[in-house]
């Protein structure tokens, strides 16, 4: 008799999925030699750990305390890139820029970046048809309680000046149903933090509003003042000029308004 | 088997771009570091630079920083390797390298090495 | 850049005779998780390089037993029991415990 199985709203798990983890982990340590004391297998037995044989609506912060043990990795706390709605070209930009990080920069977040897993309640199988959809099905899922969790540890390590990347092509630029705006920016320490620096990407050509002056940049403002951290926010009329101007900062049109 | 294949020998002139190909089969393209080395006539090996295929990240040598790009396709499990501003200093045999994993841990050795590819710069 | 330097850059050898060859490295290639990461290769007339040695002394595969590496943080030896004429081409270490990963200067291995 076949098994009954859960339909979830979401996609299943990316095909591939312990393999893909198992290859990512050990590309990680070949090319930072720093997280070459890390065990990879280790790694993957914590990952599966923590959702495996496990209802995927019933996953907490504490399934993945294992992994966040294996996973501690020390990055400059003042060389933070938090980005929203933005992943390319927060990654591109620390790609050019070496010596700051995004999350997906760090051993956790290059792991899971792009995937989708999930398990079965009482059962070793992960599940390649179907996972909780956020929305639809749950929010403690597996990828999302994942998600919250090195959010909120890579938010709390951040000092002095952080940069977030904002996407100015989207209706709410600060949006704060987003991980940055529901975990990042509440987890930013005020006794450490001095400021978050708000970079507003501009995606049309002519596009030469002064989007700082958002209402919801003024919503990001007042809950990063309340917080008593302060805030300052620019714009980026032209993103690839500016990625231009991070790789040749000496070039003469990098002087003028990016 | 595994294996790296490079495009065939080139013949350039001092001032222009090479850009030398590496297709890999065997493996998943994507699972693996792919290597940049060059070896002029008589000389030591000297690595120039790095891609993760799946991400597309890259790292390069100091020394090669502004001349050097190194490119995947996915799609052809190819790595790509492009030289501009050719001088005479650059005539060498250009080679993509990757690891092994031994036991879910890199080796840090070149083990898979394509055949080479020749580059020659003429003025 | 860690700096590896080769002793001697070449050596003519009677066949099943051992052999030794000599690299020095500029920093320690001891990591933390206990491995030094300091590799041999060689590379015959013509071809490209092949991995004999990874992590200083583990063979790599398919690599006779006849070679064998040793060595503390900075001082590291290759050596062949007893040379055969297959062995003959440019042996070169490598360190690979940061990046750039650098290369030895070479040493020439000669049949007499």
């Known amino acids: 008799v076949p098994r009954w199985r859960q339909q979830w709203s979401g996609p299943g798990t990316t095909k591939r999925f312990p393999e893909t983890v198992l290859a990512r982990c050990v590309k990680y340590t070949e090319i930072h030699p720093e997280m070459r004391h890390v065990d990879c297998q280790s790694v993957w037995d914590a990952f599966k750990g923590a959702f495996i044989s496990k209802h995927p609506c019933n996953i907490t912060e504490e399934d993945y305390q294992p992994l966040m043990k294996l996973g501690t990795q020390t990055v400059p706390c003042n060389k933070i890139l938090l980005w929203s709605r933005i992943k390319d070209l927060a990654h591109q930009f620390t790609q050019v820029q070496r010596d700051m990080f995004t999350l997906e920069d760090t051993l956790l977040g290059y792991l899971a970046d792009d995937l989708t897993w999930c398990g079965e309640f009482n059962t070793s199988k992960i599940n390649y048809q179907s996972c909780p959809d956020w929305r639809k099905d749950c929010s403690n899922n597996p990828v999302s309680v994942f998600w919250k969790t090195v959010s909120r540890r890579f938010a709390e390590a951040a000092c002095d000046v952080v940069h977030v990347m904002l996407n100015g092509s989207r209706s709410k630029i600060f949006d704060k149903n987003s991980t940055f705006g529901s975990v990042e920016v509440h987890n930013l320490q005020p006794e450490k933090v001095q400021t978050l620096e708000a970079w507003v990407i501009h995606g049309g050509r002519e596009d030469s509003r002064d989007l700082c002056q958002d209402p919801t940049i003024k919503e990001l403002e007042s809950i990063i003042s309340k917080r008593n951290i302060q805030f300052s926010c620019k714009n980026i009329y032209r993103p690839d000029k500016f990625l231009q101007c991070v790789k040749n900062p000496e070039d003469s049109s990098c002087t003028s308004e990016i | 088997q595994m294996q790296l294949v490079q495009s065939g020998a080139e013949v350039k002139k001092t001032g222009s771009s090479v850009k030398v190909s590496c297709k890999a089969s065997?493996?998943?393209?994507?699972?693996?570091?792919m290597h940049w080395v060059r070896q002029a006539p008589g000389q030591a090996l000297e690595w120039m630079g790095w891609?993760?295929?799946?991400?597309?990240?890259?790292d390069y040598a100091q020394k090669f920083q502004d001349r050097v790009t190194i490119t995947a396709d996915r799609s052809m499990s190819t790595a790509y390797m492009e030289l501009s501003s050719l001088r005479s200093e650059d005539t060498a045999m250009y080679y993509c390298?990757?690891?092994?994993?031994?036991?879910?841990?890199?080796?840090?050795?070149?083990?898979?090495w394509g055949q080479g590819t020749l580059v020659t710069v003429s003025s | 850049d860690i700096v590896m330097t080769q002793t001697p850059l070449s050596l003519s050898v009677t066949p099943g005779q051992p052999a030794s060859i000599s690299c020095q490295s500029s920093?320690?290639?001891?990591?933390?998780?206990?491995?030094?990461?300091l590799n041999w290769y060689l590379q015959k007339p013509g071809q490209p390089p092949q991995l004999l040695i990874y992590?200083?002394?583990t063979r790599a595969a398919g690599v006779p037993d006849r070679f064998s590496g040793s060595g503390s943080g900075t001082d590291f030896t290759l050596k062949i029991s007893r040379v055969e004429a297959e062995d003959v081409g440019v042996y070169y270490c490598?360190?690979?415990?940061?990046?750039?990963?650098?290369f030895g200067q070479g040493t020439k291995l000669e049949i007499k």
């Open positions: 065997g493996y998943t393209f994507t699972d693996y570091i």
């Open positions: 992590w200083m002394s």
């Open positions: 490598q360190q690979f415990l940061e990046y750039p990963p650098t």
């Open positions: 390298a990757r690891v092994a994993i031994i036991t879910t841990v890199a080796s840090g050795g070149f083990a898979y």
């Open positions: 891609i993760d295929p799946e991400y597309g990240s890259t």
């Open positions: 920093e320690s290639l001891l990591h933390s998780n206990g491995k030094t990461y």
